[in-house]
Amino acid sequence: HNTTVFQGVAGQSLQVSCPYDSMKHWGRRKAWCRQLGEKGPCQRVVSTHNLWLLSFLRRWNGSTAITDDTLGGTLTITLRNLQPHDAGLYQCQSLHGSEADTLRKVLVEVLADPLDHRDAGDLWFPGESESFEDAHVEHSISRSLLEGEIPFPPTS
């Protein structure tokens, strides 16, 4: 899977979309999970409604929401009040039994609010005596990483 980068501004909302083949994934619930470590598991953040027919209903877990357009074949995840610690590698998944197919690998990047000069990422440069933690992700809006290239490790 290629990895698609979604960039959002700290404090704002970020919408991540994961298109899929609606016929192939007919009847399947979906999930949004966060990759833990290079070879670690993908930890479930939120999943669609237990009843597949009600997948269009938005479900929240904390500041993360998920909704599924099963007819159009688009899973949408909303990250509200985006924070630097939200940056990292995620997956949109299609669930079947105890198995999960990856619909899309997503790299979430959190950009500093240009009006907010707190330490929130790679966009601003602090004073001489300070430094900021490098985001350790590849950068570009709506860019897919090259096949086989893994943008790891993410900032957690």
């Epitope: 900021f132 933690e133 490098d134 290239e149 790891f152 900032t155």
Partner: antibody
Framework: QVQLVQSGAEVKKPGSSVKVSCKAS????????MNWVRQAPGQGLEWMGR????????NYAQKRQGRVTITADESTSTAYMELSSLRSEDTAVYYC????????????????WGQGTLVTVSS | GVVMTQTPLSLSVTPGQPASISCRTS???????????LHWYLQKPGQSPQLLIY???NRVSGVPDRFSGSGSGTDFTLKISRVEAEDVGVYYC?????????FGQGTKLEIK
């Protein structure tokens, strides 16, 4: 194979500018940070800044900010470092260095370096 | 920025003998993702620097196993188990956990 080929040596007058180029080949230029590091005669290495060619994002060392401009041309896979208002203490060898992207087993270090460009600032 | 202090600044070693270089940093290099981005470079006379070890202890392909890196947090060490003539040059520690990236002052290794 990965190669970074830099432009030739330059002799400049104080107050002028210099633009050093770094032509990359053998890898996806757009998706790796390119760094510029300098080394004054007999001194250590000093990081000047970096650019992500895919979107032009840059970071600079605070010390040099304002005098250094790092750019990249994706069409020719070439990165540039321009240093303005040159002073004698800017006499140094300037290196471009690719930042190895974060793949499993490899990580965020400068794995390929150009051959260096000597910039001499003298009146 | 992160200040990196290398010791010693110069080292004269008999071939076949071990050598050790220390690198201390002004703040922890552990990234919030758990990784430590401390690297070692060697600059041989008249050459560009070359990457030897990345992420504290990972040898670059082609680097002899007599080179090893260790450490954590703010305290790191590069060891050469048996120095050879081709190892001469200046060794630099460097960090890429935080921007701006920084280098140590360098340690010059000479052969006795």
């Amino acid at each position: 194979q990965v190669q970074l080929v830099q432009s030739g040596a330059e002799v400049k007058k104080p107050g002028s500018s210099v633009k050093v180029s770094c032509k990359a080949s053998g890898y996806a230029f757009s998706s790796h940070w390119m760094n510029w590091v300098r080394q004054a005669p007999g001194q250590g290495l000093e990081w000047m800044g970096r650019i992500y060619p895919g979107d032009g994002q840059t970071n600079y060392a605070q010390k040099r900010q304002g005098r250094v401009t790092i750019t990249a041309d994706e069409s020719t896979s070439t990165a540039y470092m321009e240093l303005s208002s040159l002073r004698s203490e800017d006499t140094a060898v300037y290196y471009c260095a690719r930042l190895l992207r974060n793949q499993p087993g490899e990580s965020y270090a400068m794995d390929y370096w150009g051959q260096g460009t000597l910039v001499t600032v003298s009146s | 920025g992160v200040v990196m202090t290398q010791t010693p600044l110069s080292l004269s070693v008999t071939p076949g003998q071990p050598a050790s270089i220390s690198c201390r940093t002004s703040q922890s290099l552990v990234h919030s993702n758990g990784y430590t981005y401390l690297h070692w470079y060697l600059q041989k006379p008249g050459q560009s620097p070359q990457l030897l070890i990345y992420k504290v202890s990972n040898r670059v392909s082609g680097v002899p196993d007599r080179f090893s890196g260790s450490g954590s947090g703010t305290d790191f060490t590069l060891k050469i188990s048996r120095v050879e003539a081709e190892d001469v040059g200046v060794y630099y520690c460097s960090q890429s956990t935080r921007v701006p990236y920084t280098f140590g002052q360098g340690t010059k290794l000479e052969i006795k």
